[in-house]
């Protein structure tokens, strides 16, 4: 008789999940020689240990501590780029501006980027059929808890001027319920972080509005100011030109506003 399996509302574990995590770990150490000390098999064992045989609605940050320890990494604390709902552009930016880092440029973020995973209580199986959805099922699921944990640590590590890229095309440019709004904003350390600088990325070609005046940006400014961190905001009217100018800052067209 086939064993009854819990049906969750979200997609199941990404296919080839163990192979992908292990391969990404080795690739990361190949790309980043300073991380060559990392034992990728141990990293996978710690990752697996965080969620295998555990109820996928009962995962805690504590479950991920062995993985956090193995993935400890020092990034320049004044070169951190946070993002919300605009991941691709943030990653294109750090690909060009090599001295800046998004969470996905760190080992742990790179390992898990775009993946889904969960297990089942009391069995060593990975659930490839379905995993809990944050809204419909539970918030303490393996994926959500992982990103909450690594995002908190990443924000806590930041210092000086922290940048955040926000999507100006969204109805809520700053969303209190995003990882940035619910985790990272509240874990920036006022004794280390002087300023949070928001870059609001415009979507429309002819959009010349000052999106820094958007009510949600004002709400972000208020939250940040109450935490004794200065706030500044810039409109990025032409993201394509912005990237081009990061690549070639000496280009004559890069002196004008982007």
């Amino acid at each position: 008789v086939p064993r009854w399996r819990q049906q969750w509302s979200g997609p199941g574990t990404t296919k080839r999940f163990p192979e992908t995590v292990l391969a990404r770990c080795v690739k990361y150490t190949e790309i980043h020689p300073e991380m060559r000390h990392v034992d990728c098999q141990s990293v996978w064992d710690a990752f697996k240990g965080a969620f295998i045989s555990k109820h996928p609605c009962n995962i805690t940050e504590e479950d991920y501590q062995p993985l956090m320890k193995l993935g400890t990494q020092t990034v320049p604390c004044n070169k951190i780029l946070l993002w919300s709902r605009i991941k691709d552009l943030a990653h294109q930016f750090t690909q060009v501006q090599r001295d800046m880092f998004t969470l996905e440029d760190t080992l742990l973020g790179y390992l898990a980027d775009d993946l889904t995973w969960c297990g089942e209580f009391n069995t060593s199986k990975i659930n490839y059929q379905s995993c809990p959805d944050w809204r419909k099922d539970c918030s303490n699921n393996p994926v959500s808890v992982f990103w909450k944990t690594v995002s908190r640590r990443f924000a806590e590590a930041a210092c000086d001027v922290v940048h955040v890229m926000l999507n100006g095309s969204r109805s809520k440019i700053f969303d209190k319920n995003s990882t940035f709004g619910s985790v990272e904003v509240h874990n920036l350390q006022p004794e280390k972080v002087q300023t949070l600088e928001a870059w609001v990325i415009h979507g429309g070609r002819e959009d010349s509005r000052d999106l820094c005046q958007d009510p949600t940006i004002k709400e972000l400014e208020s939250i940040i100011s109450k935490r004794n961190i200065q706030f500044s905001c810039k409109n990025i009217y032409r993201p394509d030109k912005f990237l081009q100018c990061v690549k070639n800052p000496e280009d004559s067209s890069c002196t004008s506003e982007i």
């Epitope: 080839r16 192979e19 391969a23 690739k27 190949e30 790309i31 020689p33 990653h91």
Partner: antibody, heavy 120, light 107 residues
Amino acid sequence: QMQLVQSGAEVKKTGSSVKVSCKASGYTFTDYIMHWVRQAPGQALEWMGWIDPEYGRTDYAQKFQDRVTITADRSMSTAYMELSSLRSEDTAMYYCARSAHTTGFGFAYWGQGTLVTVSS
Amino acid sequence: DIQMTQSPSTLSASVGDRVTITCRASEDIYSNLAWYQQKPGKAPKLLIYDANSLADGVPSRFSGSGSGTEFTLTISSLQPDDFATYYCQQYNNYPYTFGQGTKLEIK
């Protein structure tokens, strides 16, 4: 079995560009970094750069930074190396190569090479 | 960039000889070194990785040693198939760099 098959020899004019392809088979293309190495006639090997085919992220040797572009097409399991503003010194055999994950980061697998001849 | 200096540039030897090729790095590369064999018109073949580990399918007469800045490739008893050019390569840091090569020829 694991194979890297490169495109055929090219003859190019000075100032033009060349694009060499490297088709991977026998493994999951996105699981490995792909490197490009060149060798001028009678000369030593020279590393040019790498690509992570999963994300398209690249890194290039300073010497080639302004002229080389490495790309990957995941659907075709193929990596490409494009070199622009060709000069006679770019006449060389161009190789794609990758590690084996079990052999440190030495290049355990190589393409057969693509000879690029640049003439004025 | 890390400079890799190989010596000698050319080495003449006979079948059965024991030969040693040296590679010196301009800075500490720990054990992040590979040795390759290349024959005319062919792609290089990995012989040794991590300075002293033998790659799959490579005869045991090949061995590597050293760490830090001084490395050697030894062929214990030269076979006719071993006459080729040998390169060392460091993968401790980008850009990866190769030695200028040692051509092993028949005496």
